[in-house]
């Protein structure tokens, strides 16, 4: 990561391409992540998105990218961040201190209309996606699949 401080941060609600909300619930002293339809007028959970610039030549990164990328961390509540668990193909909320581990960083993609996708920094080609009403890690095999609805999300500040 180029800078240890984010270039910007803001609060937004996260929803799927099909307008289901991503919600976070405290259960047995740990947080669970759900994908669900909210009732009318039900308040959406907010996530703090922190954006970082990543700068590297392609020969260092191994991901074929030369230049700048936008990395993001997602925190729905103080001291908890979304983490990629690549072994379990799962997305989890972990309590941790800064500096955050690489598993908490996701490369932001927003080349598909007004949706965004989150690619694991630790596992290029693997994205946060929706599976069985939960968030999971989904391997995207080809460029065409980058437009697959289950890895597309919407950000809203309202």
């Amino acid at each position: 990561i180029t800078g240890i401080s984010p270039i910007t941060e803001y609060l937004a609600s996260l929803s799927t391409y099909n307008d289901q909300s991503i919600t976070f619930a405290l259960e047995d002293e740990s947080y669970e992540i759900y994908v669900e339809d909210l009732k009318k007028d039900e308040k959406k959970d907010k996530v703090l998105l922190s954006y970082y610039e990543s700068q590297h030549p392609s020969n260092e990164s191994g991901d074929g990218v030369d230049g700048k990328m936008l990395m993001v961390t997602l925190s729905p509540t103080k001291d908890f961040w979304l983490h990629a668990n690549n072994k379990e193909h799962s997305v989890e909320l972990h309590k941790c201190e800064k500096p955050l581990p690489d598993q908490a960083f996701f490369v932001l993609h927003n080349m598909h209309s007004n949706c965004v996708s989150f690619e694991c920094k630790t596992d290029p080609g693997v994205f946060i996606g929706v599976k069985d009403n939960h968030l999971a890690l989904i391997k995207v095999d080809s460029s065409e699949n980058l437009c697959t609805e289950n890895i597309l999300f919407k950000l809203s500040e309202t």
Epitope: I7, T8, Y10, A12, Y51, E53, S58, G64, V65, D66, G67, K68, M69, L70, V107, L108, H109, N110, M111, H112, S113, N114, E119, S143, E144, L146, C147, E157
Partner: antibody
């Protein structure tokens, strides 16, 4: 170094079509979207649309929907912008532009072609 | 579509002056605003991105501020090469939209 080389100036009659090319070099072509922005003489900048070279998906400004087609050829790292049913108001310099960040347009457009002047006149 | 309103449309200033240009979005665009400089017959040049981040190679006399709907570009001490037209652009959602431009002229 990173550069975008555009095709030369065109003079077209009303009702005709024009196809402008933009050849990219010096970077990983499929990692960056390509945007098209036009500027009529003495006027401001107007965004026309974007193509994602990775899969070829496009997003067009409503104003140009149905008249514009953006395509890409990954084998030559070239994108194309075709505008049909030309009218005199389409006389402008057409720029291709690459975003500052891979996969995202949030950080602005930092690499621009020199522009292609398209003149529509009977 | 998000409308971007830039003001003033032109400003006359002298070398050494401090120049401020404002840009207002018709709805919130988070911090995703870029500023460009354009000289006659040339392509635009990115100066500022994400509202306040200085693009590599751009002199530090240029600065950006603001978030949400109201943004400002400041040139702290105008230099002869800064006489040009400046555009803001929202990079939050498609369609991307530009302000109408501000021409900085020699007084």
């Amino acid at each position: 170094q990173v550069q975008l080389v555009q095709s030369g100036a065109e003079v077209k009659k009303p009702g005709a079509s024009v196809k402008v090319s933009c050849k990219a070099s010096g970077y990983t072509f499929i990692s960056y979207g390509m945007h098209w922005v036009r500027q009529a003489p003495g006027q401001g900048l107007e965004w026309m649309g974007e193509i994602n070279p990775h899969g070829g998906s496009t997003s067009y400004a409503q104003k140009f929907q149905g008249r514009v087609t953006m395509t890409r050829d990954t084998s030559t790292s070239t994108v194309y912008m075709e505008l049909s049913s030309l009218r005199s108001e389409d006389t402008a310099v057409y720029y291709c532009a690459r975003p500052s960040a891979a996969y995202s347009h949030y950080l602005g457009l930092d690499i621009w072609g020199r522009g292609t002047l398209v003149t529509v006149s009977s | 579509d998000i409308q971007m309103t830039q003001s003033p449309s032109s400003v006359s200033a002298s070398v050494g002056d401090r120049v401020t240009i404002t840009c207002r979005a018709s709805q919130g665009i988070s911090p995703w605003l870029a500023w460009y400089q354009q000289k006659p017959g040339k392509a635009p040049k990115l100066l500022i991105y994400a509202g306040s981040s200085l693009q590599s190679g751009v002199p530090s006399r240029f600065s950006g501020s603001g978030s949400g709907t109201d943004f400002t570009l400041t040139i702290s001490s105008l230099q002869p090469e800064d006489f040009a037209t400046y555009y803001c652009q929202q990079a939050n959602v498609f369609p991307l939209t530009f302000g109408g431009g501000t021409k900085v002229e020699i007084k």
